[in-house]
């Protein structure tokens, strides 16, 4: 299962749910379904309010039981290291794949903190964050923000990806926004 | 009390096919995962290949992929395996086995050999 | 391609204990508590004796005990008796082969 990190903000805003949450437990594997599921402790939310309704309190996080199948692995061991989860909600349930946004809160520099938190959110009805995989590339719409970073940087934590966010300037244009500047 | 009986083992030259059937009871077919392991002549067990309870999930060892085919029956409680370009190292006792594999089939031989 | 570790051959005295290791990684004995451990006479199917680590299914001796450190799982036998003589194999589910199978131990009782 092979897929290109998100930029964090497409992450949020293609997210149904996005939360901050520690892993307690090993994960169990359904005898029917054969999918596995780890035990969380939700400390945030930060998007899925009106999807989750009153079931407000999300306990399992689910996911393929095999990495060829994008199952997603939680290898960390530290049981009271806080994760930046975005999910999908089939049925009620999270459910992640390797392809989905999981990472330790402490390893997102402040920007992406803030654009989890707050500014992301701004982005996602009108704006687009269009990756850029090989030159040429051009933008297809104003609404759409170039991401260069893989290309710049062979890397997902590129400058774009760590401190930038795609927003709204005017009507039917979007631009890169500096997320460090709105930092409080 | 949970029953498993396997069939369709038997002789059949390289590069042939063979389809396996397990024929389960005495629990909620549907309930359960199921899974194929086999077992050479003298070697130790190897996991083949599982598929979920509504059989929408399918999950293959390398050595088999895309030579065999898991598939289930609900409605008959049987659980299959298409076996296809058959060689010599697929040779082995094939069990069909429960869930986290709790019960065991006794087993059918399949031997590949010209 | 053998995915758990386990010694070829152990033996002991009837009366006696032994254990038997079975050594992974952290994306399957480590990974889950999901070791289980089968018994094996000659020309018969496996024989259950301890699922999820350390439980013991129902009609299985209590001289048959479980239990995993890390990435190791062990297979305790107490007061050996001659039919404990068999084959031993581990399993466990794995992150990226999905179930394996340790290599198997030939347990002989002197």
């Known amino acids: 299962c092979t897929c290109v990190p998100p930029h964090p903000q497409t992450a949020f805003c293609n997210s149904d749910l996005v939360i901050r949450a520690k892993f307690v437990g090993t994960p169990e594997v359904n005898q029917t379904t054969l999918y596995q599921r780890y035990e969380i402790k939700m400390t945030k939310m930060y998007k899925g309010f009106q999807a989750l309704g009153d079931a407000a309190d999300i306990r399992f996080v689910y996911t393929p039981a095999m990495e060829s199948v994008c199952g997603y692995f939680h290898r960390s061991h530290n049981r009271s290291e806080e994760f930046l989860i975005a999910g999908k909600l089939q049925d009620g349930l999270l459910h992640i794949t390797t392809c989905s946004f999981v990472a330790p809160w402490n390893s997102l520099s402040l920007a992406q903190r803030r654009g989890f938190t707050k500014t992301y959110t701004v982005g996602c009805e009108e704006c687009t964050v269009f990756p850029c995989l090989s030159i040429p590339c051009k933008l297809q719409s104003g609404t759409h923000c170039l991401w260069t970073d893989q290309l710049l940087q062979g890397s997902e934590k590129g400058f774009q990806s760590r401190h930038l966010a795609c927003l709204p300037r005017e009507p039917g244009l979007c631009t890169w926004q500096s997320l460090r500047s709105q930092i409080a | 009390q949970v029953q498993l009986v396997e069939s369709g083992g038997g002789l059949v030259q390289p590069g042939g096919s063979l389809r396996l059937s397990c024929a389960a009871s005495?629990?909620?077919?549907?309930?359960?995962?199921m899974s194929w392991v086999r077992q050479a002549p003298g070697k130790g067990l190897e996991w083949v290949s599982a598929?979920?309870?509504?059989?929408?999930?399918?999950y293959y060892a390398d050595s088999v992929k895309g030579r065999f085919t898991i598939s289930r029956d609900n409605s008959k409680n049987t659980l299959y395996l298409q076996m296809n370009s058959l060689r010599a190292e697929d040779t082995a006792v094939y069990y069909c086995?429960?869930?986290?594999?709790?019960?065991w089939g006794q087993g059918t031989l399949v031997t590949v050999s010209s | 391609d053998i995915a758990l570790t386990q010694p070829a051959s152990v033996s002991g005295s009837p009366g006696q204990s032994i254990t038997i290791s079975c050594t992974g990684t952290s994306s399957d004995v480590g990974g889950y508590n999901y070791v289980s451990w089968y018994q094996q006479h000659p020309g018969k199917a496996p024989k259950l004796m301890i699922y999820d680590v350390s439980n013991r299914p129902s009609g299985v001796s209590n001289r048959f005990s479980g239990s995993k450190s890390g990435n190791t799982a062990s297979l305790t036998i107490s007061g050996l008796q001659a039919e404990d003589e068999a084959d031993y194999y581990c399993q466990s589910y794995d992150f990226v082969r999905f179930m394996v199978f340790g290599g198997g131990t030939k347990l002989t009782v002197l």
């Open positions: 598929i979920s309870g509504s059989g929408g999930s399918t």
């Open positions: 086995a429960r869930g986290h594999v709790d019960y």
């Open positions: 005495g629990f909620t077919f549907s309930s359960y995962a």
